[in-house]
């Protein structure tokens, strides 16, 4: 049994880090493998993560971390029984993938303006809470070419757009994702999408 693709890990900078790797053949990850992780430098206990299958030869493990600070560094040991398959380290602050925003809502009752709001996925005491910026994706269900991205570079989890920038009388969907420049994070996953019917009063043409 060998590791084909070494573990790579990302942290949500709150409570979970996710590590993925591939074995050289079909593996029952949960029964055959264990990923041990331990904070270095600190007095700490080695914790065990039981991996799950992620495709035939792929494994994924969700490492529980009650909090994260920038200095944290973990040793990672991948074991198959008594055999050490791989040894590495992981610094969560250098591999951050934010949590996806939630509760995306489209408010259509504000005088020909669409107001999109969503929730910041972090509690106020988390460092990322005040450092997230967002991308909002809006697309038409009827027209695949009608696909647009709005970058929200301010901290407020909301976006206002004129309803008239979209076509009237058809259905649109929106979703939102987040990233944090301060830690040069990857983008989060997209939030679940929300759907609405876009309609607005055409301006009266005067001759």
């Amino acid at each position: 049994m060998k590791v084909l693709q070494e573990p790579t890990c990302v942290s949500d900078y709150m409570s979970i880090s996710t590590c993925e790797w591939k074995m050289n053949g079909p593996t029952n990850c949960s029964t055959e493998l264990r990923l041990l992780y331990q904070l270095v430098f600190l007095l700490s206990e080695a914790h065990t993560c039981i991996p799950e299958n992620n495709g035939g030869a792929g494994c994924v493990c969700h490492l529980l971390m009650d909090d994260v600070v920038s200095a944290d560094n973990y040793t990672l040991d991948l074991w198959a029984g008594q055999q050490l398959l791989w040894k590495g380290s992981f610094k969560p602050s250098e591999h951050v993938k934010p949590r996806a925003p939630g509760n995306l809502t489209v408010h259509t009752n504000v005088s020909d303006t669409l107001l999109l709001t969503w929730s910041n996925p972090y509690p106020p005491d988390n460092y990322l809470y005040n450092h997230l910026t967002y991308a909002v994706n809006i697309w038409s269900e009827n027209d695949p070419a009608d696909f647009r991205i709005y970058n929200v570079t301010y901290l407020e989890p909301s976006l206002r757009i004129a309803a008239s920038t979209l076509k009237s009388g058809i259905s649109y969907r929106a979703r939102v994702r987040a990233w944090a420049q301060c830690y040069n994070t990857t983008w989060s996953e997209w939030s679940p999408s929300t759907k609405w019917h876009n309609s607005y009063r055409e301006p009266f043409e005067q001759h």
């Epitope: 904070l39 430098f41 007095l43 206990e45 080695a46 971390m65 009650d66 909090d67 600070v69 200095a71």
Partner: antibody
Framework: QVQLKQSGPGLVQPSQSLSVTCTVS????????VHWVRQSPGKGLEWLGV???????DYNAAFKSRLSISKDNSKSQVFFKMNSLQADDTAIYYC????????????WGQGTTLTVSS | DIQMTQSPASLSASVGETVTITCRAS??????LAWYQQKQGKSPQLLVY???TLAEGVPSRFSGSGSGTQFSLKINSLQPEDFGSYYC????????FGAGTKLEVK
């Protein structure tokens, strides 16, 4: 709610040993480590050692040769034993719960006051 | 072992005042620092960990700051229940505590 209750003697003679039991409730010893800390007027707060959720132990090097920490998960009890006591071991001895992955102490026992005297 | 130097050793203040207690580490401990409060005859209580994260149930008038070797605990608008002793603790192995600061009523 989370509680740690300590029991043990108050007076011990020099060269004898101290045994303290810390009985916990509101959480499982299979999920949390338990530390031992002492406090004396002369030396302040001193960390002595810990027994982790998995049963492994770490000790302060200054006390390692005469300290032993064990536990019984099913009885929710942690056992602390320190040998070869001298007058400067007179202190209040506390058990305390480890908070998550950080060795900080979010719940403490009420303390066991030890006097070493003949 | 890393030494923690806490200052001042004692401090007198009145209800409503703001006070700051400092802790200096003999070497870099990043943000691996906690603060505890202890009232006479009682066990210590965790206030802050990771240098600035408030423990559950701790009032927002308490705040921690610093990293590396210099840290501080600030108490805004002192309340009667805030008087007692305060200790810093680093959690690099082996753990050590500061000698404490006794906060008394002026």
């Amino acid at each position: 709610q989370v509680q740690l209750k300590q029991s043990g003697p108050g007076l011990v003679q020099p060269s004898q040993s101290l045994s303290v039991t810390c009985t916990v409730s509101g959480f499982s010893l299979t999920n949390y480590g338990v530390h031992w800390v002492r406090q004396s007027p002369g030396k302040g707060l001193e960390w002595l050692g810990v027994i982790w959720s998995g049963g492994s132990t770490d000790y302060n090097a200054a006390f390692k040769s005469r300290l032993s920490i064990s536990k019984d998960n099913s009885k929710s009890q942690v056992f602390f034993k320190m040998n070869s006591l001298q007058a400067d071991d007179t202190a209040i001895y506390y058990c305390a719960r480890n908070k998550g992955t950080r060795p900080v102490f979010d719940y403490w026992g009420q303390g066991t006051t030890l006097t070493v005297s003949s | 072992d890393i030494q923690m130097t806490q200052s001042p050793a004692s401090l007198s203040a009145s209800v409503g005042e703001t006070v700051t207690i400092t802790c200096r580490a003999s070497e870099n401990i990043y943000s691996y620092l906690a603060w505890y409060q202890q009232k006479q005859g009682k066990s210590p209580q965790l206030l802050v960990y990771n240098a600035k994260t408030l423990a559950e149930g701790v009032p927002s008038r308490f705040s921690g700051s610093g990293s590396g070797t210099q840290f501080s605990l600030k108490i805004n608008s002192l309340q009667p229940e805030d008087f007692g002793s305060y200790y810093c603790q680093h959690y690099v192995s082996p753990l050590t505590f500061g000698a404490g600061t006794k906060l008394e009523v002026k």
